[in-house]
Interface confidence: medium
């Protein structure tokens, strides 16, 4: 007995809705750059990530997650918003690229913000030249803030149990749907081989339906990939990756990245302290 395509489609749509609902729980963060997105060589830039109240970790990702920096030094931007600031003291050509924010608000990670492109240009005006584009953001307009020093950037947290269960659940359902689809397609093929359909209509319909289901499944899988599965990569401890994972691990030296995690306007002498380690190593999993 073959599964009814309508029931299958229902299951697929149900899965898609589940993933969609999980996404909608957390608002997307916004990202901006101060003093702007076009920065003269040698000048400083501060990325401002903003999300809702209750954020425990903000992450600034660079060039599609190949490098990232976390901070738990989250400031209150307003009674309903929180923010974190990531500062690069002396911008180099290597700092140019696409940046975006993501945050962890228990028990899950948010979607990513829009990308913000940082452009680095040669400048004759020197490091303090005000020759920058005005503050630019992806998302709501941002503002200057907290004039103190972020003293550290904690390592990213391990994959949460809740995330794991969701991922396993989604994967199992997805594989089950895929199996049903394959069986269904094989069944239809057998039917077609056995004899011609009774009408032209019937010849087309079975062909259309699985395609629709496959299309929905593909788009669902896409969503799961964008907002779910790579979180495993993002949250996996670098030590765990290094200690015998089947993935090949590359340690990228992020000297050029040199996020010093300091805020835009240094007020006290304390805020001139560098991070404990200015050269950061990030584990980049290559599949």
């Amino acid at each position: 007995m073959s599964p009814h395509p309508t029931a299958l489609l229902g299951l697929v749509l149900c899965l898609a809705q589940t993933i969609h609902t999980q996404e909608e729980d957390l608002p997307r963060p916004s990202i901006s750059a101060e003093p702007g997105t076009v920065i003269p060589l040698g000048s400083h830039v501060t990325f401002v990530c903003r999300g809702p109240v209750g954020v425990q970790t903000f992450r600034l990702e660079r060039d599609s997650r190949s490098t990232y920096n976390d901070t738990e030094d989250v400031s209150q931007a307003s009674p309903s918003e929180s923010e974190a600031r990531f500062r690069i003291d002396s911008v180099r050509e290597g700092n140019a690229g696409l940046y975006r924010c993501i945050y962890y608000k228990p028990p899950k990670w948010s979607e990513q913000s829009d990308y913000l492109e940082l452009l680095v240009k040669e400048s004759s005006g020197g490091p303090d030249s005000p020759d920058t584009e005005p503050g630019s953001s992806a998302g709501p307009t941002q503002r200057p803030s907290d004039n103190s020093h972020n003293e550290h950037a904690p390592a990213s947290q391990g994959l949460k149990a809740e995330h794991l269960y969701i991922l396993i659940g989604v994967s199992v359902v997805f594989l089950f749907c895929l199996l049903l689809l394959v069986l269904f397609c094989l069944h239809r093929q057998n039917q077609i081989k056995q004899g011609p359909p009774r009408s032209k209509d019937e010849e087309q319909k079975p062909q259309q339906r699985p395609d629709l289901a496959v299309d929905v499944l593909e788009r669902t899988a896409d969503k799961a990939t964008v907002n779910g599965l790579p979180e495993k990569d993002r949250e996996t401890d670098t030590s765990a990756l290094a200690a015998g994972s089947s993935q090949e691990v590359t340690y990228a030296q992020l000297d050029h990245w040199a996020l010093t995690q300091r805020t835009a306007r240094a007020v006290s002498p304390q805020s001139t302290k560098p991070m404990a380690e200015s050269i950061t190593y990030a584990a980049v999993a290559r599949h």
Epitope: G54, Q56, D73, Q76, D146
Partner: antibody, heavy 113, light 108 residues
Framework: QVQLQQSGAELAKPGASVKLSCKAS????????MHWVKQRPGQGLEWIGY????????KYNQKFKDKATLTADKSSSTAYMQLSSLTYEDSAVYYC??????WGQGTTLTVSS | DIKMTQSPSSMYASLGERVTITCKAS??????LSWVQQKPGKSPKTLID???RLVDGVPSRFSGSGSGQDYSLTISSLEYEDMGIYYC??????????FGGGTKLEIK
Amino acid sequence: QVQLQQSGAELAKPGASVKLSCKASGYTFTSYWMHWVKQRPGQGLEWIGYINPFSGHTKYNQKFKDKATLTADKSSSTAYMQLSSLTYEDSAVYYCARNFDQWGQGTTLTVSS
Amino acid sequence: DIKMTQSPSSMYASLGERVTITCKASQDINSYLSWVQQKPGKSPKTLIDRANRLVDGVPSRFSGSGSGQDYSLTISSLEYEDMGIYYCLQYDEFPPYTFGGGTKLEIK
């Protein structure tokens, strides 16, 4: 419902230290910052600083940097403010405020010899 | 530090009257402003966030407006329970968050 229960009135001598508490209930303590605000008799409100109970990170008004120390105990969902080297100027009502959307009832501190 | 100047410092108004309190910042604060009410002998209560967002549970007769350096709080129809001191609070640049000096509102 959200409640911030502050410790009772304190009477202290000049030069002494005092630790005020603010017990939170009705919400996830680590998800909201806790601010402390000072109000002298017949005067306005003055922001002292805040603590992020999750990370323990604090931010202070420069004016109170050497006066106040903010801490938080996640296990008891309680925020604390220690005031040191007390002077008569420290006599005031001190409020804790969750993100400025919920306020405690205030603790009256009287510094007197 | 950003200085917040409120006016008037005190005022009398009749029940049912429309009341407006203003607050001026020493620089542009990008609408990062809250309005806080303190009734006599009570702890403060936040009414408005982000210059015009009403906090949950606050009566709709309260409204906030403004941008840049100039902001105002309006009570559309004054009620007896609205008597108290109103403070504006900026959080555009911090530390420190700064409050205005307060406006004492009394019933005629």
